[in-house]
Amino acid sequence: CDLPQTHSLGNRRALILLAQMGRISPFSCLKDRHDFGLPQEEFDGNQFQKTQAISVLHEMIQQTFNLFSTEDSSAAWEQSLLEKFSTELYQQLNNLEACVIQEVWMEGTPLMNEDSILAVRKYFQRITLYLTEKKYSPCAWEVVRAEIMRSLSFSTNLQKRLRRKD
């Protein structure tokens, strides 16, 4: 399964789209910045097998897709860019799912690392809570956009490490 190469390209496209989605100057939102506690250790490709790493990537993309598929998100972003971004994420999810199935069939390794999946879910819960507390304000969404770009960058780096392992 040659996931990392195709997935990295998709991730880069998603990052570019997310960069283009900015609607207000982030410099008007400096006071709204927040530490969401990105679980960076979950993006350390050395600590688990390829299948488990792929399942963490899948969870990250899935949660990002869910976050940007809400009604509140639709109201916050320019529709055509949001649709392109969501389509890119959806394509990545399909690639990841196919890859996990292939890896499990070939390697027989466990499908996921429960602790890592839970860490990613809690991270997105913190993001959702922040948006709720900030009443989905434009600045709150701008802060979240930067944070998701950061997390997507981390997952891109994990993919690079996976490629070196292959």
Epitope: L15, I16, A19, Q20, G22, S25, P26, F27, C29, L30, K31, R33, H34, D35, G37, V143, A146, E147, M149, R150
Partner: antibody
Framework: QVQLQESGTVLARPGASVKMSCKAS????????MHWVKQRPGQGLEWIGV????????TYNQKFKDKAKLTAVTSANTAYMELSSLTNEDSAVYFC?????????????WGQGTTVTVSS | DIVLTQSPASLAVSLGQRATISCRAS??????????MHWYQQKPGQTPKLLIY???NLESGVPARFSGSGSGTDFTLNIHPVEEEDAATYYC?????????FGSGTKLEIK
């Protein structure tokens, strides 16, 4: 690899204007903010402002609002800074620097600097 | 504007010893879990190089002998053990609010 190539040394008269360039390569130019920083000889660093090449959005240090104008041409992957009404105080090295880590606003890659000398 | 006061202005440290540089902000640069203070190294005739971001995060490729700490208004850069190649001027920079500002710099000399 990421590179920021700045224009060469500039000698200008007081009251004149100068426009310096910063050509970016090795990364997606339109998706990173670009900062500009001033350093006077033997002195510290001063943040001038920042531009987002993707849409031309700019934010300035109020101190430089009437002094510096930041622009970018995406087709050329180049950012520009124009300094107007030059005085001796504007004699300095000017760096373009790429924004890093999104909204942490640190600077990872720096151009080699453009030296501006204002003299009559 | 937030003023960053660095001390000392210069220091001389013996090879292998510890160098400690302080940066004090006139107003807190920490919000909601992050401290928006960063450290750079500038060698003569060179461009500044990012060492530490968000007060304590070591930039990729920077030797582990560099470390940063602090929150609110008081921040510290430590270098231990100091090596010859560490002779440079060190600047702190905040990104807590506009305008971003730099400290006046600390010149490190190796004895």
């Amino acid at each position: 690899q990421v590179q920021l190539q700045e224009s060469g040394t500039v000698l200008a008269r007081p009251g004149a204007s100068v426009k310096m360039s910063c050509k970016a390569s090795g990364y997606s130019f339109t998706t990173y903010w670009m900062h500009w920083v001033k350093q006077r000889p033997g002195q510290g660093l001063e943040w001038i402002g920042v531009i987002y090449p993707g849409n031309g959005d700019t934010t300035y240090n109020q101190k430089f609002k009437d002094k510096a104008k930041l622009t970018a041409v995406t087709s050329a992957n180049t950012a520009y800074m124009e300094l107007s009404s030059l005085t001796n105080e504007d004699s300095a090295v000017y760096f373009c620097t790429r924004n890093y880590k999104y909204d942490y606003y640190t600077m990872d890659y720096w151009g080699q600097g453009t030296t501006v000398t204002v003299s009559s | 504007d937030i003023v960053l006061t660095q001390s000392p202005a210069s220091l001389a440290v013996s090879l292998g010893q510890r160098a400690t540089i302080s940066c004090r902000a006139s107003k807190s640069v920490s919000t909601s879990g992050h401290s928006y203070m960063h450290w750079y190294q500038q060698k003569p005739g060179q461009t500044p190089k990012l060492l530490i971001y968000l007060a304590s995060n070591l930039e990729s490729g920077v030797p582990a002998r560099f470390s940063g700490s602090g929150s609110g208004t008081d921040f510290t850069l430590n270098i231990h053990p100091v090596e010859e190649e560490d002779a440079a001027t060190y600047y702190c920079q905040h990104s807590g609010e506009l305008p971003f500002t730099f400290g006046s710099g600390t010149k490190l000399e190796i004895k």
